[in-house]
Structure formats: C-alpha cells, structure tokens
Interface confidence: low
C-alpha cells in the first residue's frame, strides 16, 4: 500500500478514503513533494503583505511587503517598517542616527563612523547621518607641500544638503 502512495506526484495527495488513489490538491492547497498524505494550506498574502508569487498545486504562495515595509525572517514571515537613510527603527519608531553614527539604508541600525586613525589614515570626507567618513592618506603620506595646504572641503553628493 505504501508503494501506491509513493507514486502520487507533487500537486496530489494519497487519499486514504479512496483506496489510496492520488487525488489533486483541493483549491488553495498544495503539495510540493510526491507521496504526501495531505496537501498544505496555501499561505495568504494579506494585510501588510502582498503576493509575489501565486500559490499553485505544487508550490506555496510567496509574499512580499507593501511599500514602506521590508521582509524579515524566513520566507518573509514578517514585515518591518522602513526608515529613512540616516535613521534606525527603535521602540519609539524611526529615530535619527546619533552624532558619530550613520545608516545608508532604509533598514538596520546606525553604525559608528570608521575610525580612520586606527589605520593610520586621516579623514578625507566627513561623515554624516547617511554616510560613513571617507579615509584618505595618512598625514605622513602627503608631500610637504600638500600637507600645509588647506584640506579639501567635504564632498557632497548632488542634491545632498549640508548637515
């Protein structure tokens, strides 16, 4: 009898009520492997989720998050609110990065600026809430003429307002 069930392909289940005939999965259910005794209920992408891939008889639905949210967890089991660059999500919502830290993404936490001096380098471009510092050559690497020159103003991306 077990051999009969093993012949049931994905998209079907081995129906004990019908002499172990392979029956198609009912609507809104699937079996992704052969030899299944039941079909699994399809995931519904509702609420904060939107459908990325519809459920079929052989594979579960796949969900994505609505605009303003991003996926968390295995198979996008949760959606987390986006923040702006230069912010992190806290218990009280999106908060600006503290001075000396930055976040260049809509998710994750603020991270400390790189400490250029640890690598024997100097700060070429100052950090912002959205961007890490850019390290340049160490003062010793600069030629005597260049070392006494006025350091360059921090570079800014087009459309980027000063902090």
């Amino acid at each position: 009898l077990q051999d009969l069930c093993s012949n049931c392909p994905a998209g079907t289940f081995c129906d004990n009520n019908r002499s172990q005939i392979c029956s198609p999965c009912p609507p809104n259910s699937f079996s992704s492997a052969g030899g299944q005794r039941t079909c699994d209920i399809c995931r519904q992408c509702k609420g904060v989720f939107k459908t990325r891939k519809e459920c079929s008889s052989t594979s579960n639905a796949e969900c994505d998050c609505i605009s303003g949210y991003h996926c968390l967890g295995a198979e996008c089991s949760m959606c987390e609110q986006d923040c702006k660059q230069g912010q992190e999500l806290t218990k009280k919502g999106c908060k600006d990065c503290c001075f000396g830290t930055f976040n260049d993404q809509k998710r994750g936490i603020c991270r400390p600026w790189t400490n250029c001096s640890l690598d024997g380098k100097s700060v070429l471009v100052n950090g912002t809430k959205e961007r890490d510092v850019v390290c340049g050559p160490s003062p010793a690497d600069l030629s005597p003429g260049a070392s006494s020159a006025t350091p360059p103003a921090p570079a800014r991306e087009p459309g980027h307002s000063p902090q």
Partner: nanobody
Framework: EVQLVESGGGLVKPGGSLRLSCAAS????????MSWFRQAPGKGLEWVSH????????DYADSVKGRFTISRDNAKNSLYLQMNSLRAEDTAVYHC???????????????WGQGTLVTVSS
C-alpha cells in the same frame, strides 16, 4: 488564537466623524503595539497610525495627522480610531493589526482583522 474584530464603519458625509473599534482576544493585549491600516478600493494597503502597549507612544500617517486620533483601553482589550473631518479619500476598509512585541512597525501575517468599511460620500 489571536482574534481582532473591527466595528464602527459606515456611510458618513464629508466633514463628518466616525469612531472605529477593534476588539482583541487571544493574547496579552497591553504588551503589544497596535496599528490601524486602510485599503481604499483598488488601491494598496496604507498604514494609518499606531500606538504602543501603554499608549504613551503614538504616530500617524501625514494624510490623517490632526484629523484622526488613535487610543486604546487595555482593561477592555480594545483599540479605537476617532476619525474627524472625514474626506472622500478616507473611503476604505480599515483594519486593525497587532504589531510584533519586539518592535513597532513589524507585523506578521496572522494578526490582522477582517476590516470595517468606511464610506465618505455626500
């Protein structure tokens, strides 16, 4: 099992008011941030507001700020949305949602109510 049941929707004229309620059961209500979302006909889901478990932290979408007020009564396991100065563009199905206890803005797909329809029309 987590259950969220919204009520209070209906037909209202522009400029009018409605108060939505969400009755929660099956979890420690006061431990969780709660949210209101809405879905206008043919549109995507839009976050409206959320409130922390104690009610001390509240935030609103810009589109409803100054017109809508979120509140909760933990003794009654209930969430509310007072909607004033309603506009035609507020027409939508309103859903309450339980956010993840670790972080506001994080919602899993099981913890949603079926919604209550608000229609703003003259």
């Amino acid at each position: 099992e987590v259950q969220l049941v919204e009520s209070g929707g209906g037909l209202v004229k522009p400029g009018g008011s409605l108060r939505l309620s969400c009755a929660a059961s099956g979890f420690a209500f006061s431990d969780y941030y709660m949210s209101w979302f809405r879905q206008a006909p043919g549109k995507g889901l839009e976050w409206v507001s959320h409130i922390s478990g104690s009610g001390t932290t509240i935030d609103y979408a810009d589109s409803v700020k100054g017109r809508f007020t979120i509140s909760r009564d933990n003794a009654k396991n209930s969430l509310y949305l007072q909607m004033n100065s309603l506009r035609a563009e507020d027409t939508a199905v309103y859903h309450c949602a339980r956010e993840d206890s670790r972080m506001p803005g994080t919602t899993d797909f099981d913890n949603w109510g079926q919604g209550t329809l608000v229609t703003v029309s003259s």
